[in-house]
Interface confidence: medium
Amino acid sequence: GYKAEVMVSQVYSGSLRVLNRHFSQDLTRRESSAFRSETAKAQKMLKELITSTRLGTYYNSSSVYSFGEGPLTCFFWFILQIPEHRRLMLSPEVVQALLVEELLSTVNSSAAVPYRAEYEVDPEGLVILEASVKDIAALNSTLGCYRYSYVGQGQVLRLKGPDHLASSCLWHLQGPKDLMLKLRLEWTLAECRDRLAMYDVAGPLEKRLITSVYGCSRQEPVVEVLASGAIMAVVWKKGLHSYYDPFVLSVQPVVFQACEVNLTLDNRLDSQGVLSTPYFPSYYSPQTHCSWHLTVPSLDYGLALWFDAYALRRQKYDLPCTQGQWTIQNRRLCGLRILQPYAERIPVVATAGITINFTSQISLTGPGVRVHYGLYNQSDPCPGEFLCSVNGLCVPACDGVKDCPNGLDERNCVCRATFQCKEDSTCISLPKVCDGQPDCLNGSDEEQCQEGVPCGTFTFQCEDRSCVKKPNPQCDGRPDCRDGSDEEHCDCGLQGPSSRIVGGAVSSEGEWPWQASLQVRGRHICGGALIADRWVITAAHCFQEDSMASTVLWTVFLGKVWQNSRWPGEVSFKVSRLLLHPYHEEDSHDYDVALLQLDHPVVRSAAVRPVCLPARSHFFEPGLHCWITGWGALREGGPISNALQKVDVQLIPQDLCSEVYRYQVTPRMLCAGYRKGKKDACQGDSGGPLVCKALSGRWFLAGLVSWGLGCGRPNYFGVYTRITGVISWIQQVVT
């Protein structure tokens, strides 16, 4: 019998260029008579053009929704009702070819062609893209608040904020033909629920979405997005009602930046330079293609690429890479944004060099990618350390902390977190090394204590990059480095003269002069520690709630002991900058550290002094007794304390703590407390210091109060941010 053919709606979006008309500002106002008149003519022309081709039998509807420069560009969509079996045959490319063919066939024709009655359409300026019914609905929902803007070369155009009576607005942006548009979004409120989506075309086509951002992101307070060409659309969807624009948008045309380079590396190890996508840190554009060719001076070396918060992974099958595609020596890899450092190590087998290609495979892009490149010794990639094959990083070996996700850095250790005697491979505790007392059979623990040694897990690296054998030599009153750098920056970690309350838990004035109280509207929220004249360190999770993210809310008190009263040694500061660790992850508490820059430098006194920061190699031995201080609750669920409390806690081996917390303890965490519980940090202590006293009498910052199960519960220790695990970031910021 006869079977009705199934028809489907195929939606197309596009633009065409009219050579005999000019754009005017009237055409940006949808309510103007010029706009209504021009759309009527343009609609008619579009319909006639389509119906002049074999697509005519499938024509369903069409609409011209906007105009732009060039001399006049019309932006439109149309729907064809086509038999299902022909759907794939009528791709946007095929439809565009049919329409262009029609236009070309009448260019020199003297015959009357309906669609050419008023418009001279440029065949080369026709663009047809795939769209969907959903895209058209999204477009229509913005037409009540539709803004077209043309931005000329050398201009930076600040866009007018959205109409708050509308629920959605669209900015249609256009620039000069051979340039690309760069959009800058700056969030101006601490919290909002607004949503912004950027498209690589004139309208909100889902398949051409570059990126979407949501809700006054603190992780990215400023976002710069590149289009692949001179057209872009930005769609705003209203969040909470607000009389203030929660963001500022500005746009500028920029020239295409070539992303090709030929480099020859020097005969030295470590980082030698940086490769990045165009206009880094802007998001890379949807049609980015970078090709970097690096020549290595000798086959002794391999090439290392060090990424920041970005990793390369093998992609299963031929699925597209959603966060950038890489080809390195014909190996296809996909980029993946992660909250960790990562290195890709490329063995070199031929002197021809290495070509690295980066491509954005889909229109969806992401933050610009930057990679540091350098050489490593292929026979010894990590001198004195362990090469973690999971992430390509060199990590300390046998220090009692599983730095590598697979834990191999702590396997097959002859001596874990101890010193290995040369004579018989027995293990002695680290504080016994270079202490003037031979503990190994033939005294190998006391050899080479006055000279440079190869760098390793527990050696201290001097400023001149040489290493010394003595563990924890910083600020012990005796220069161990040739350049004396182990005794620099030592105006720290000394307690003020204090009349201690013997056996008590209440601290006295000047006892912990680095202790900070971080307050909002006169209420103590978190602890912190002074580490430099203008910097206080605390926990990132103190700023977890959007309402706590603004610097203007916070006041930092130093030299404080009592919450309900002030004394002469106390000083307060406003916060000029708040920096959370870029890898901080709220759910896992990893990298739970933040830095506050004070609005003016501290004046040091007996009551206000910084604590000493440990070197990355500083070893805080499990079993060591250290101290935590804070105004936190005195019992689980209780109110905060009026007096600054102090309590001694014991450092716990990482493996045991990891077991207790079911392997949620990362290498950036350190545990302290007691198996019986009782002594612990609690709510309100967050961000406060865990300090350990060195033999020199100076106090070093070992940790920051981070998390734990309850307070003082048996079998559950307090978990602290391990300062040695984040020290390189701290130093990078503070210096």
């Epitope: 702590e410 101890t418 014991q650």
Partner: antibody, heavy 124, light 110 residues
Framework: EVQLVESGGGLIQAGRSLRLSCAAS????????IYWVRQIPGKGLEWISS????????AYADSVKGRFTISRDNAKNALYLQMNSLRAEDTALYYC?????????????????WGQGTTVTVSS | QSALTQPPSASGSPGQSVTLSCTGT?????????VSWYLQHPGKAPKLMIY???KRPSGVPDRFSGSKSANTASLTVSGLQAEDEADYYC??????????FGGGTKVTVL
């Protein structure tokens, strides 16, 4: 004097059950992890179970898991081992031992006080 | 969990030193610094001699010393005396709150 005294051993048929007790004195019982360790006559020591002071962490050797149950009553300063489905290979001298005392509450996994043991003989 | 490996016997003359070995795996002796040594005289309960690889409980003479290298722990008894004749057992923490013992070494003072 710090002391641990085991009791409850005896001759028992295979497949049956037996309950061992360990009475503690001379120290703060509820501040210590307590272990059961057994020794087959003329053979070595075998750890079989341990229990934390609050009974919230309990562990068993694979050889007894599912058959033996450790428990404690801090009010009575007593430790127990309920042994079900006994086998001939469970024949041994059963010791209870406390974890090493320390100045601070820390992990040691070492036993500094032992009882004299109670003998369990399982006949097949 | 399998037992740690100890040599069945060792001997030495009075005044001499004897070193006992205890071999485990990278998951127990090799991984944790929780190796203990016990001495047991016939018919008596074991006595703790060393904990945490090399620490001596109070009352244990300093003739007894412990050390560790890779997956092997050692107990050295120097200045051997007649009363040191006994069975010696090592133990190690093996993760997940479990403890594993060695098979024991019989020390004879010649």
């Amino acid at each position: 004097e710090v002391q641990l005294v085991e009791s409850g051993g005896g001759l028992i048929q295979a497949g049956r059950s037996l309950r061992l007790s360990c009475a503690a004195s001379g120290f703060t019982f509820d501040e210590h992890v307590i272990y059961w360790v057994r020794q087959i006559p003329g053979k070595g020591l075998e750890w079989i179970s341990s229990i934390s002071w609050k009974s919230d962490i309990i562990a068993y050797a694979d050889s007894v898991k599912g058959r033996f149950t450790i428990s404690r009553d801090n009010a009575k300063n007593a430790l127990y081992l309920q042994m079900n489905s006994l086998r001939a290979e469970d024949t041994a001298l059963y010791y209870c031992a406390r974890e090493k005392d320390g100045d601070f509450y820390y992990y040691y996994f070492a036993m500094d006080v032992w009882g004299q043991g109670t003998t369990v003989t399982v006949s097949s | 969990q399998s037992a740690l490996t100890q040599p069945p016997s060792a001997s030495g003359s009075p005044g001499q030193s004897v070193t006992l070995s205890c071999t485990g795996t990278s998951s127990d002796v090799g991984y944790y610094n929780y190796v203990s040594w016990y001495l047991q005289h016939p018919g008596k309960a074991p006595k703790l001699m060393i904990y945490e690889v090399s620490k001596r409980p109070s009352g244990v003479p300093d003739r007894f010393s412990g050390s560790k290298s890779a997956n092997t722990a050692s107990l050295t008894v120097s200045g051997l005396q007649a009363e040191d004749e006994a069975d010696y057992y090592c133990s190690s923490y093996a993760g997940s709150n479990k403890v594993v013992f060695g098979g024991g070494t019989k020390v004879t003072v010649l």
